[in-house]
């Protein structure tokens, strides 16, 4: 089946899609754009706001197969790619493009993964080898982070304070995070 065609870095690009993690310049087939619904009042000044909810970045849906060595997922998985500049939500364009709303000497914001989720994947292997089962880490949502110029150039800082999250929700679901009891005694799911 031409297993050699699959990449060794756990990605196989579906034709028509750019190679991850390079952010696409334009939407292509099999991609949809999902602007983060962050809303909020527009800031008085792009750099003065303390409310991270007033900043937004793009979440691109991205479909691909995953591989582990010579083994490939039976089905493609869909995840998000965090793309584009961060800016006040009211100033972000509706289509992906290069819009410079910031001053050249303004702070540098990056659109990066915020939360992750796990998805079970069955990997089919060539030559009659036993299939594998893995849990792949996928991006669930994106957020804006600020590049700190006072420290290491590569150091990313959260924009705005983070508080304790007793029930953190890393999936795109209600933030209230429940707790469920051990289900081992309830099921023989296999």
């Amino acid at each position: 089946q031409g297993w050699q065609a699959f990449k060794n870095d756990a990605t196989e690009i579906i034709p028509g899609l750019r190679e991850y993690p390079e952010p696409p310049q334009e939407l292509e087939n099999n991609q949809t754009m999902n602007r983060a619904e962050n809303g909020g009042r527009p800031p008085h000044h792009p750099y003065d706001t303390k409310d991270v909810s007033e900043y937004s970045c793009r979440e691109l849906h991205y479909t691909r197969f995953v591989t582990d060595g010579p083994c490939r997922s039976a089905k493609p998985v869909t995840e998000l790619v965090c793309s584009g500049q961060c800016g006040p939500a009211r100033l972000l364009p509706n289509a992906i493009g290069r819009v410079k709303w910031w001053r050249p000497n303004g702070p540098d914001f990056r659109c990066i993964p915020d939360r992750y989720r796990a998805q079970r994947v069955q990997l089919l292997c060539p030559g009659g080898a036993a299939p594998r089962s893995r849990k792949v880490r996928l991006v669930a949502s994106c957020k804006c982070k600020r590049l700190t110029r006072f420290h290491n150039q590569s150091e990313l800082k959260d924009f705005g304070p983070e508080t304790a999250r007793p029930q953190k929700g890393r999936k795109p679901r209600p933030r209230a995070r429940g707790a469920k009891a051990n289900q081992a005694e309830l099921e023989n799911a296999y």
Epitope: D114, A118, A130, R132, R134, R137
Partner: antibody, heavy 121, light 109 residues
């Protein structure tokens, strides 16, 4: 490289509560899935609970349901495990463990040094 | 609650081969239980040897390997060394909940 540093040993009286902390470095807490495991003296490992990234919930072992609370403070990259209504059988070393933040979720890859909790009247 | 069973103790000669097994009270262990194997020496925290049935880690000696055998997860040690004497635990994933086995005390004698 993920590193986990836990709080120091505790001595508690029966009926009291204990809160053990687990400080993460090398990655941010929001990138990881923290689980808690305990080991009574001379006994085996026992899973208490942890974050399941598949459905975005903290799952507690049935045995500890209602007595244990696992929380996280992302501003300090510190995870906490609080166990209430302590009894002598809760005397154990408590470990936090996490995945390696790799492309594949592989849990329990990195372990804290353990926190000895002694419950004695 | 599911019960995960291991041999309480096993002995292997230096250079010999031994297989530790891990069974589930709910039925056959499959790849969807993502079996883990840990090594623990006295006074130390556990150390992961195998994840997801057969996936070794950078620190896992090549003489250790994981597999499924006869409806159980298995850890095979080929060419046992004195430093392999330790307690070995398996762990199974039941849909996000985990259960440890009781542990196998491996003696290299």
């Amino acid at each position: 490289e993920v590193q986990l540093v836990q709080s120091g040993a505790e001595v508690k009286k029966p009926g009291a509560s204990v809160k053990v902390s687990c400080k993460v470095s090398g990655y941010t807490l929001s990138e990881l899935s923290i689980h808690w495991v305990r080991q009574a003296p001379g006994k085996g490992l026992e899973w208490m609970g942890g974050f399941d990234p598949e459905d975005g919930e903290t799952i507690y072992a049935q045995k500890f349901q209602g007595r244990v609370t696992m929380t996280e403070d992302t501003s300090t990259d510190t995870a906490y495990m609080e166990l209430s209504s302590l009894r002598s059988e809760d005397t154990a070393v408590y470990y936090c463990a996490t995945d390696s933040a790799g492309y594949w979720y592989k849990f329990f890859q990195h372990w804290g040094q353990g926190t000895l909790v002694t419950v004695s009247s | 609650q599911a019960v995960v069973t291991q041999e309480p103790s096993l002995t292997v000669s230096p250079g010999g081969t031994v297989t530790l097994t891990c069974g589930s009270s709910t039925g056959a262990v499959t790849i969807d239980h993502y079996p883990y194997w840990f090594q623990q020496k006295p006074g130390q925290a556990p150390r992961t040897l195998i994840s997801d049935t057969d996936d070794k880690h950078s620190w896992t000696p090549a003489r250790f390997s994981g597999s499924l055998l006869g409806g159980k997860a298995a850890l095979t040690l080929s060419g046992a060394q004195p430093e392999d004497e330790a307690e070995y635990y398996c762990l199974l994933d039941y849909g996000g909940s985990f259960v440890f086995g009781g542990g196998t005390k491996l003696t290299v004698l």
